[in-house]
């Protein structure tokens, strides 16, 4: 599975989404879990009602909520009041029995709020001759870049590593 | 209603391959995981692997990777199963399941009748 | 892989009878356990789903039951069409695995 890289701003929420063949995983329940290390477990956080037919009610488990939609194909978890503490590796899970499908791994990054004044010194603003019309960002503020850093996915607000 | 046919029986040389079908009908054969199951005479059951014909995503059981492949042809609703290098150890009656999903797990619903295959010189 | 047994491989009983078979994991299914019935002429039935649930149109004579490693179906009222083998299969971890099937014999 590629990683699909999702940014989020500290204090705000996020929503990341999880599309899979909703024929493909029919009757399953799906989960949300934090990858513990490279090789390590993914731990669960969330997993979608006990009944798959109740799957589009939003559960909650602490600020991680999760919702179904089954005929859509679309999963879609959502953290709240985001934290740098949140900032990982996680992956949506398609389940059966105790077996678990990776549908999609999802590289969480936290930007810091551009209104807190403390990190103003570190925030990067684009120059005059700078233009990201063509850019598809979920946020419009930017964090600072290192070097040779790519200000902005070119094409979607999700991007893929390999 | 729901109808798996598999093909009929084979006889076939030590180290010579096979590859026996199952036509399913009475549903979208598409969206329907297919299961394999072998059965050697006076023996249980071993699961092979399962197929989605959807995509052709299989998933085999670790005792059969490199044995067998799982293929699906969704124009003529038909799932195979090719065996590879065979031995007398692959003589066999084989199964070709549709699954359901059942309170979260999967389960074969529908089987069809079963292919004997014979390996012998 | 989670081995599956089945102690008992042929029980001979008699018409009429209530004959259990057991099903024994080596480790916890929760539940996720099916039972299938082979006929002489080989054709497969699934019977039970989920430990106790009944297959659409299985006669009501058939029960399941059991948790954790320990699971058994029930025949409440033996007849000459149950006939048969029985397999117990978990579908709880990948690779699926059955029992080694219980022969049902009529005195």
């Known amino acids: 599975h590629n990683t699909t890289v999702f940014q989020g701003v500290a204090g705000q929420s996020l929503q990341v989404s999880c599309p899979y063949d909703s024929m493909k995983h029919w009757g399953r329940r799906k989960a949300w879990c934090r990858q513990l290390g490279e090789k390590g477990p993914c731990q669960r956080v969330v997993s979608t009602h006990n009944l798959w037919l109740l799957s589009f009610l939003r559960r909650w488990n602490g600020s991680t909520a999760i919702t179904d939609d089954t005929l859509g194909g679309t999963l879609t978890i959502t953290l709240r009041n985001l934290q740098p503490h949140d900032a990982g590796l996680y992956q949506c899970q398609s389940l059966h029995g105790s077996e678990a499908d990776t549908l999609r791994k999802v590289l969480v990054e936290v930007l810091a709020d551009p209104l807190d004044h403390r990190d103003a010194g570190d925030l990067w603003f684009p120059g005059e001759s700078e233009s990201f019309e063509d850019a598809h960002v979920e946020h419009s503020i930017s964090r600072s870049l290192l070097e040779g850093e790519i200000p902005f996915p070119p094409t979607s607000h999700h991007h893929h590593h390999h | 209603q729901v109808q798996l046919q598999e093909s009929g029986p084979e006889l076939v040389k030590p180290g010579a391959s096979v590859k026996i079908s199952c036509k399913a009908s009475?549903?979208?054969?598409?969206?329907?995981?297919m299961n394999w199951v072998k059965q050697r005479p006076g023996k249980g059951l071993e699961w092979i692997g399962r197929i989605y014909p959807g995509d052709g995503d299989a998933d085999y059981n670790g005792k059969f990777k490199g044995k067998a492949t799982l293929t699906a042809d969704k124009s003529s609703n038909t799932a195979y199963m090719q065996l590879t290098s065979l031995t007398s150890e692959d003589s066999a009656v084989y199964f070709c399941?549709?699954?359901?999903?059942?309170?979260?797990?999967?389960?074969?619903?529908?089987w069809g009748q079963g292919t004997l295959v014979t390996v012998s010189a | 892989d989670i081995q599956m047994t089945q102690t008992t491989s042929c029980l001979s009983a008699s018409l009429g009878d209530r004959v259990t078979i057991s099903c024994r994991a080596s480790q916890d299914i929760n539940n996720y356990l099916s039972w299938y019935q082979q006929k002489p002429d080989g054709t497969v039935k699934l019977l039970i789903y989920y430990t106790s649930k009944l297959h659409s149109g299985v006669p009501s004579r058939f029960s399941g039951s059991g948790s954790g490693t320990d699971y058994s179906l029930t025949i409440g009222n033996l007849e000459q069409e149950d006939v048969a083998t029985y397999f117990c299969?978990?579908?709880?971890?990948?690779?699926?695995?059955f029992g080694g099937g219980t022969r049902l014999e009529i005195k």
């Open positions: 399941a549709r699954l359901h999903i059942y309170d979260g797990y999967y389960v074969s619903v529908y």
């Open positions: 009475g549903y979208i054969f598409s969206y329907s995981w």
């Open positions: 299969q978990q579908g709880d971890t990948l690779p699926w695995t």
